[in-house]
Amino acid sequence: GSERTCCPVNWVEHERSCYWFSRSGKAWADADNYCRLEDAHLVVVTSWEEQKFVQHHIGPVNTWMGLHDQNGPWKWVDGTDYETGFKNWRPEQPDDWYGHGLGGGEDCAHFTDDGRWNDDVCQRPYRWVCETELDKASQEPPLL
């Protein structure tokens, strides 16, 4: 397909990527599916600068990102290396806490109210951020 040269309607351009910020909540997997159907992915934070950009747009609200350890090790949804990459966890996080009483631990990462990261139960209906890089196959999600 043709290359995407500008961001779709209702998406925000920043540093050659496009971002879409939800204003309502979904479970992590459903948020992930939404982004993928838009030829995007849950946001992958690769720098302090990108962290501040996303934080500015989401405000003090729990918001899913594209980081999980549902299959063991922590992984970014786009394959970005977790071990060597940017991290911004809250102190003593991630802790895979089992005390929430919902079954299992905590396998999905989200921005907390101060922007730092926490792991939480993936079924919680948090807001989310989609990201897609410019110069990928073009798609402009329309307005209803």
Partner: antibody, heavy 121, light 107 residues
Framework: EVQLLESGGGLVQPGGSLRLSCAAS????????MSWVRQAPGKGLEWVSA????????YHADSVKGRFTISRDNSKNTLYLQMNSLRAEDTAVYYC??????????????WGRGTLVTVSS | EIVLTQSPATLSLSPGERATLSCRAS??????LAWYQQKPGQAPRLLIY???NRATGIPARFSGSGSGTDFTLTISSLEPEDFAVYYC?????????FGGGTKVEIK
């Protein structure tokens, strides 16, 4: 005119295959995710498959997983559904539908008229 | 998957009357709910999206309300062309699912 037109339905024996097509016109096809939705005779609607605008991401209902494959050719403005290992319970009218994103949901804002698939010996 | 239960299954009303259709979800779907109209031999048509927003070209007599698990489609004054089957659909959780439908028939 903005429209979707399905084709490829017909009578097929159990275990057989069919390939449905959906020709899109009047809008920029590659801008939209697309879905297939089916309706058994006298029954309700059932989502079957979905595909992103580029074709890079696909999803299938558990009832058809491993048997049906959704694909698209954006150069031809056409959506496809390859149906293998067909069963009697796959008998239905198959609609293609356009997925319009709004506030985090994909709503089917444009539908074709459907094509009937009958699986019977 | 989320189960949507529509009631009543059939609604018998006269033109000019008010129709109230219900859709209940087995768990919260927030406002990720749509309503579709389907006439015999035709494809469904999107009426309402995001629980309460009318789709393009839909008359003002159609309105949607609700959030969480309980939703309502209201047709304020039935026109002859409104007699059809109405389906709700949730988009909160994968896979997207539909209710079983409510048939609005002429009394």
């Amino acid at each position: 005119e903005v429209q979707l037109l399905e084709s490829g339905g017909g009578l097929v024996q159990p275990g057989g295959s069919l390939r449905l097509s959906c020709a899109a016109s009047g809008f920029t096809f590659s801008n939209y995710a697309m879905s297939w939705v089916r309706q058994a005779p006298g029954k309700g609607l059932e989502w079957v498959s979905a595909i992103s605008g580029s074709g890079g991401s696909t999803y299938h209902a558990d009832s058809v997983k491993g048997r049906f494959t959704i694909s698209r050719d954006n150069s031809k403005n056409t959506l496809y559904l390859q149906m293998n290992s067909l069963r009697a319970e796959d008998t239905a009218v198959y609609y293609c539908a356009r997925d319009a994103p709004y506030r985090g949901g994909h709503y089917f804002d444009l539908w074709g008229r459907g094509t009937l698939v009958t699986v019977s010996s | 998957e989320i189960v949507l239960t529509q009631s009543p299954a059939t609604l018998s009303l006269s033109p000019g009357e008010r129709a109230t259709l219900s859709c209940r979800a087995s768990q919260s779907v927030s406002s990720y709910l749509a309503w579709y109209q389907q006439k015999p031999g035709q494809a469904p048509r999107l009426l309402i999206y995001d629980a309460s927003n009318r789709a393009t070209g839909i008359p003002a007599r159609f309105s949607g309300s609700g959030s969480g698990t309980d939703f309502t489609l209201t047709i304020s004054s039935l026109e002859p062309e409104d007699f059809a089957v109405y389906y709700c659909q949730q988009l909160a959780s994968w896979p997207p699912t539909f209710g079983g439908g409510t048939k609005v028939e002429i009394k």
